[in-house]
């Protein structure tokens, strides 16, 4: 029978038929930076080319006995998970291995850097199709390793890395903390985070998604026909590298941003038991388990969005947190969240020619997060319209006044320390969906976008009695671009998007009382692109899966900003 | 990468004309920073990645590395250039005493220096 991990990444509609994906990934080359490998193993023979690159530290111990089977174990297994004949994800992918880890699985940042440089030079000398680089390793946070990954990603290479096996925040490790890298945590057959003793998979905002990483059967370096089960975030990353190879083979022109959005979009949602994660990390950790797309094309019509959390601002009164999108993504909305509820809102502002989302801490607050909603919107022209605090008691409001511009998100920011909970909730007048409404002492920021065929609508869910969480979701075919709360009063901890659902969190019910002051409304802005849908339909007639991405060609900007991580 | 662990005496003589003070001091207000792994057991002191500013050319990287060697030699320190980076990041990998970090951070074109550290199979 099909191993549990391969079944898990197979689209649900095919599981009944024991669906086996085709020998995908044939147009893609996957570079593996790991231990030495047993290239004549039957699983990977002829699929993996061992490069002459080797940069490893001495094994500890002057008389260390180099045993080939131990030395090759990690790398051989991962090569098998990516492209193995029987137990591989992308059975058609070709691989190249670089040795950066010694027989004890240990390497150096400098050796890894030289390896990444080797890949870049190889790419320049002999340009091939899409490249995926698998980094199944982790060290402490390294500015230089992250910078090298950023540069390689900027050169069009897709980097996939292990989140780390330290049961810790992945942002404390590299290359896991590099924003441009696709960082993968590990889950087991029950879709639970992988545990081993006091350790286990890393988590947090620097993880993009999870994938199978416990008891994964793959090639064993014991012998050329041996298999063995191994566990770890390396195995999880290898699954995602394989899925990425399949996706890139079907659509070779996909950019890193497009690939990441698709990986997120096709993942299984909300299946991980978040109780395993530390409480403060649950909201930051993506509840996503990687899966292959249901087919090689047909995703192009979708408006893809993801949620990007900033680093924590820290507790000082004027502290701010900034969340950024990738260069070829549009920031369509900005929200903020504070566990203490003490915050001064958020605003979208220009930085280096690109919009960023900045959240503001308040006096006595323990700090805030900025949450950006980052979307793939070709040929988009977005701007922010701001209204200063209003004099009238009706509250502040701002709308998209330019012809053809639609509202994609609302933010509010206030200078006063406490907006108070004594003002009645502000209700949006009917027939004016294209405007943002907020507290009269807050400045309001509307994100207004023009893009071919873009249409958006506002969806609200209000609860008169106080409740810790209010949610509102977009319907099938619509994508959540904006998420905010009405009113922006002090008992609201903040708002954030989880997949296609807008979540508004409020203070513990017991502290707010049950008066009408506790009323909270979650406001979702749901959008879709008729232009993308139309382009997709036109493509359905052709047999080729490539060309889908021609739609996305309009906006390819180099990722030159070194920014906080993503979901 | 050729071995730079050559005759230091010769290197010092060749660069004798350079004063101990830096000929090309870093631009005013930009201070290079030093980084090291927060996890102490993973640190590898004695090996450093010197990262140069983004637009630095390979020839400037090599010149900066030679300058570091010359200035270190004058102070009685041996250094070994292990690799000169170009293609992804400009800079070089150097084996040297941590005592030389202050000197290295003042070299022209230096953006930051990071102490090497371990990475592990996951």
């Amino acid at each position: 029978s099909i191993p549990w991990n391969l079944e898990r990444i197979t689209p649900p509609r095919y599981r009944a038929d024991e669906y086996q994906p085709p020998d995908g990934g044939s147009l893609v080359e996957v570079y593996l930076l790991d231990t030495s490998i047993q290239s004549d193993h039957r699983e990977i023979e002829g699929r993996v080319m061992v490069t002459d690159f080797e940069n490893v530290p001495e094994e500890d111990g002057t008389r260390f006995h180099r045993q080939a089977s131990k030395c090759d174990s990690h790398g051989t297994h991962l090569a098998g998970v990516v492209s193995g004949r029987d137990a591989g994800v992308a059975k058609g992918a070709s691989m190249r291995s670089l040795r950066v880890l010694n027989c004890q699985g240990k390497g150096t940042v400098s050796g890894t850097l030289i390896g990444l440089e080797f890949i870049r030079k190889s790419q320049l000398v002999q340009p091939v199709g899409p490249l995926v680089v698998l980094l199944p390793l982790a060290g402490g946070y390294s500015r230089v390793l992250n910078a090298a990954c950023q540069r390689l990603a900027r050169a069009g290479v897709v980097l996939v890395t292990a989140a780390g096996n330290f049961r810790d925040d992945a942002c404390l490790y590299s290359p896991a903390s590099a924003p441009e890298v696709i960082t993968v945590g590990a889950t087991n057959a029950q879709d639970q985070p992988v545990t081993l003793g006091t350790l286990g998979t890393n988590f947090g905002r620097c993880v993009d998604l999870f994938a199978p990483g416990e008891d994964i059967i793959g090639a064993s370096s014991d012998c050329s026909t041996c298999f063995v089960s191994q566990s770890g975030t390396s195995q999880a990353a290898a699954h995602v590298a394989g899925i990425a190879a399949m996706m890139l083979s079907a659509e070779p022109e996909l950019t890193l941003a497009e690939l990441r959005q698709r990986l997120i979009h096709f993942s299984a949602k909300d299946v991980i038991n978040e109780a395993w994660f530390p409480e403060d990390q649950r909201v930051l950790t993506p509840n996503l388990v990687a899966a292959l797309p249901p087919s090689t094309h047909g995703a192009g019509w979708q408006l893809f969005c993801r949620t990007v959390w900033s680093a924590h601002s820290g507790p000082t009164r004027m502290a701010t947190a900034v969340a950024r999108c990738a260069p070829d993504e549009e920031l369509l909305s900005c929200s903020s969240f504070s566990r203490s509820g003490k915050r001064r809102g958020e605003r979208m502002e220009a930085q280096g020619g690109k919009l960023v989302c900045r959240a503001h801490n308040a006096f006595g607050g323990e700090g805030v997060y900025a949450i950006a909603r980052c979307c793939l919107l070709p040929q988009a022209n977005c701007s922010v319209h701001t209204a200063p605090p209003a004099e009238a008691s009706m509250g502040t409001r701002v709308h998209c006044h330019q012809q053809g511009h639609v509202l994609t998100g609302c933010s509010s920011h206030w200078e006063v320390e406490d907006l108070g909970t004594h003002k009645p909730p502000v209700l949006r007048p009917r027939g004016q969906p294209n405007q943002c409404v907020g507290h009269r002492e807050a400045s309001i920021h509307a994100s207004c976008c023009h893009a071919p065929g873009l249409e958006c609508k506002v969806k609200e869910h209000g609860i008169p009695a106080p409740q810790e969480q209010v949610t509102v979701a977009c319907e099938e075919g619509w994508t959540l671009t904006g998420c905010s709360a009405l009113p922006g009063t002090s008992h609201v901890l903040g708002a954030y998007a989880v997949d296609n659902t807008c979540v508004v969190r409020s203070r513990d019910v017991s502290t707010t009382g049950s008066t009408s002051e506790g009323a909270v409304t979650a406001v979702a802005i749901c959008c879709r692109s008729r232009h993308l849908a139309q382009a997709s339909q036109e493509l359905q007639g052709s047999t080729s899966g490539s060309g889908l991405n021609d739609i996305f060609e309009a906006q390819k900007i180099e990722w030159h900003e070194h920014h906080h991580h993503h979901h | 990468q050729e071995d730079e662990d050559g005759d230091y005496e010769e290197l010092v003589l060749a660069l004798r004309s350079e004063e101990d003070g830096l000929a090309e001091a870093p631009e005013h207000g930009t201070t290079a920073t030093f980084h090291r792994c927060a996890k102490d057991p993973w640190r590898l002191p004695g090996t450093y990645v010197v990262v140069l500013k983004e637009e630095t050319h390979l020839s400037q990287s090599e010149r900066t590395a030679r300058r570091l060697q010359a200035q270190a030699a004058r102070r009685g320190y041996l250094t070994k250039i292990l690799h000169v980076f170009h293609g992804l990041l400009p800079g070089f990998l150097v084996k040297m005493s941590g005592d030389l970090l202050e000197l290295a951070l003042k070299l022209p074109h230096v953006d930051y220096i990071e102490e090497d550290s371990s990475v592990f199979a996951q």
């Epitope: 500890d60 260390f64 006995h65 298999f227 089960s229 | -």
Partner: antibody, heavy 121, light 107 residues
Framework: QVQLVQSGAEVKKPGASVKVSCKAS????????IHWVRQAPGQGLEWMGY????????KFNQKFKDRVTMTRDTSISTAYMELSRLRSDDTAVYYC??????????????WGQGTTVTVSS | DIVMTQSPSSLSASVGDRVTITCKAS??????VDWYQQKPGKSPKLLIY???NRYTGVPSRFSGSGSGTDFTLTISSLQPEDFATYFC?????????FGGGTKVEIK
């Protein structure tokens, strides 16, 4: 649950052979190497070797190389260890153990209950 | 073969005592050392893997440390169920080798 169940105690004469079985359940048998470790009365543990059940690959401690045979039957998820030309100092409890690989860590996470082999004339 | 020398070979302690067992490798084995507990008539049970990582379900009073050639197993506060024999084992190179064992007895 995951377990290894070994065959019962054996009494053998010097020069004879003994074959101990180890039946695995609760996991994919071919996914883990099965190691054999013995313990003489009142003594420490001694590693004998292992078999990778996904093939027939074996690795032995040189001390036992000429006398030990390790086999497996995947249809019944069972590993076997046969020790020939028995001597009195082979009297011991023989354990099978499953080796697990996590990250770059290796350890025996599941052990059989042990099989006592007594060699006596 | 790598020799693992365990000390002491036996010790007597009381409930609540802090107990330290050491293991010395004849050559550097990095952190490729596991610790096992064995009770009379029972199979060994994994406590610590890779020198310092506590295995699933093992109480927090057990901790391991060391790298290279010197390794330590510490029981911070001895409990009645901890009276047993403890073994270290290296997996840095074949053949795998075990220490001679440390028997922890009730004083």
């Amino acid at each position: 649950q995951v377990q290894l169940v070994q065959s019962g105690a054996e009494v053998k004469k010097p020069g004879a052979s003994v074959k101990v079985s180890c039946k695995a359940s609760g996991y994919t048998f071919t996914g883990y190497t099965i190691h054999w470790v013995r313990q003489a009365p009142g003594q420490g543990l001694e590693w004998m070797g292992y078999i990778n059940p996904s093939s027939t690959y074996t690795k032995f401690n040189q001390k036992f190389k000429d006398r030990v045979t390790m086999t497996r039957d995947t249809s019944i998820s069972t590993a076997y260890m046969e020790l020939s030309r028995l001597r009195s100092d082979d009297t011991a409890v023989y354990y099978c153990a499953r080796e697990r690989i996590y990250s770059n860590y290796w350890f025996f996470d599941v052990w059989g209950q042990g099989t006592t082999v007594t060699v006596s004339s | 073969d790598i020799v693992m020398t365990q000390s002491p070979s036996s010790l007597s302690a009381s409930v609540g005592d802090r107990v330290t067992i050491t293991c010395k490798a004849s050559q550097n084995v990095y952190t490729a050392v596991d610790w096992y507990q064995q009770k009379p008539g029972k199979s060994p049970k994994l406590l610590i893997y890779s020198a310092s990582n506590r295995y699933t379900g093992v109480p927090s009073r057990f901790s391991g440390s060391g790298s290279g050639t010197d390794f330590t197993l510490t029981i911070s506060s001895l409990q009645p169920e901890d009276f047993a024999t403890y073994f270290c084992q290296q997996y840095s190179s074949y053949p795998y080798t075990f220490g001679g064992g440390t028997k922890v007895e009730i004083k």
